[in-house]
């Protein structure tokens, strides 16, 4: 998982998906950063089924899954006046091949060739009210909500850190938006995939 | 706009059974995010459970394993099964409502279940 560092005017929050932004009428697009598969507990089912980039018979090769989870936005001592509710990106994109094992005779399912990762694609902003102890006034924040899941590609440029979206040659590149920081916490929770569609 | 209420509380004794249901009103119900939230006397509300349209779910720990969600969208209904049930069950349940990716703006107003031991 991809340690960030804090910058001033952000606040991380508990999951990887959900973090404050600016009070803004508009805010740029995240820059397409690699997502943690081990995040909220105990989702299961997972939504929507996942995307089928590759022409293959064999579905279950693909698990980019949307896993929805439900809780209340903390920032430190303060937390949201009502819960929320949204999407965990989970699994591994693209087809897993059988490659032989080294140590034993037995084959191991590894991925091969281009790196894909499942990652949020779509966000909703969506304002919250922090209560905070102490006989705080509450504060009024924009959280950004997980909406959509894709398969991106993770390229050589940027220091690996641009991804490109499933079947096409360049990442397309977003007009007068610059990508901007995001504060993440570190710690997160194990999802569960149970039963998964 | 969705209304809910609840139902189905009551007295239950340790390691007993109830069955919640959040009723709904109002044609755009199949969309919503639904979840059972609780609120034991002197604590903040928690998370229980939750369910989207179609059918993925979400448990928070204190009931997995023991609770269960589901729901009947051509009944506009959403039901949380509770087995095996314990006194610190007991609580103020609220089932609430939510756009996907979005604030649970909605809410009935409770159900109370109690757990005598």
């Known amino acids: 998982h991809h340690h960030h560092h804090h910058h001033q005017g952000w606040q991380a929050f508990k999951n990887d998906a959900t973090e404050i932004i600016p009070e803004l009428g508009e805010y740029p697009e995240p820059p397409p950063e690699l997502e943690n598969n081990k995040t909220m507990n105990r989702a299961e089912n997972g939504g929507r089924p996942p995307h089928h980039p590759f022409e293959t018979k064999d579905v279950s090769e693909y698990s980019c899954r949307e896993l929805h989870f439900t809780r209340y936005v903390t920032d430190g001592p303060c937390r949201s006046a009502k819960p929320v509710t949204e999407l965990v990106c989970s699994g591994q994109c693209g087809p897993a091949r059988l490659l032989p094992n080294a140590i034993g005779r037995g084959k191991w399912w590894r991925p091969s060739g281009p790196d894909f990762r499942c990652i949020p694609d779509r966000y909703r902003a969506q304002r919250v009210q922090l209560l905070c102890p102490g006989g705080e006034a509450p504060r009024a924040r924009k959280v950004r909500l997980v909406a959509s899941c894709k398969c991106k590609r993770l390229t050589r440029f940027h220091n690996q850190s641009e991804l490109k979206d499933f079947g096409t040659e360049a990442a397309r590149p977003q007009k007068g938006r610059k990508p901007r920081p995001r504060a993440r916490s570190a710690k997160a929770n194990q999802a569960e995939l149970e039963n998964a569609y | 706009e969705v209304q809910l209420v609840e139902s189905g509380g009551g007295l239950v004794q340790a390691g007993g059974s109830l069955r919640l249901t959040c009723a709904a009103s109002?044609?755009?119900?199949?969309?919503?995010?639904i979840g059972w939230f609780r609120q034991a006397p002197g604590k903040q509300r928690e998370v229980v459970a939750s369910?989207?349209?179609?059918?993925?779910?979400y448990y928070e720990d204190s009931g997995k394993g023991r609770f269960t969600i589901s729901r009947d969208n051509a009944k506009n209904r959403v039901y949380l099964q509770m087995n095996s049930l314990r006194p610190e069950d007991t609580a103020v349940y609220y089932c609430?409502?939510?756009?996907?990716?979005?604030?649970?703006?909605?809410w009935g107003q409770g159900t109370q279940v109690t757990v005598s031991s």
């Open positions: 109002g044609r755009t119900f199949s969309s919503f995010v």
């Open positions: 369910i989207t349209s179609g059918g993925s779910t």
């Open positions: 609430a409502a939510a756009e996907p990716a979005g604030v649970y703006d909605v």
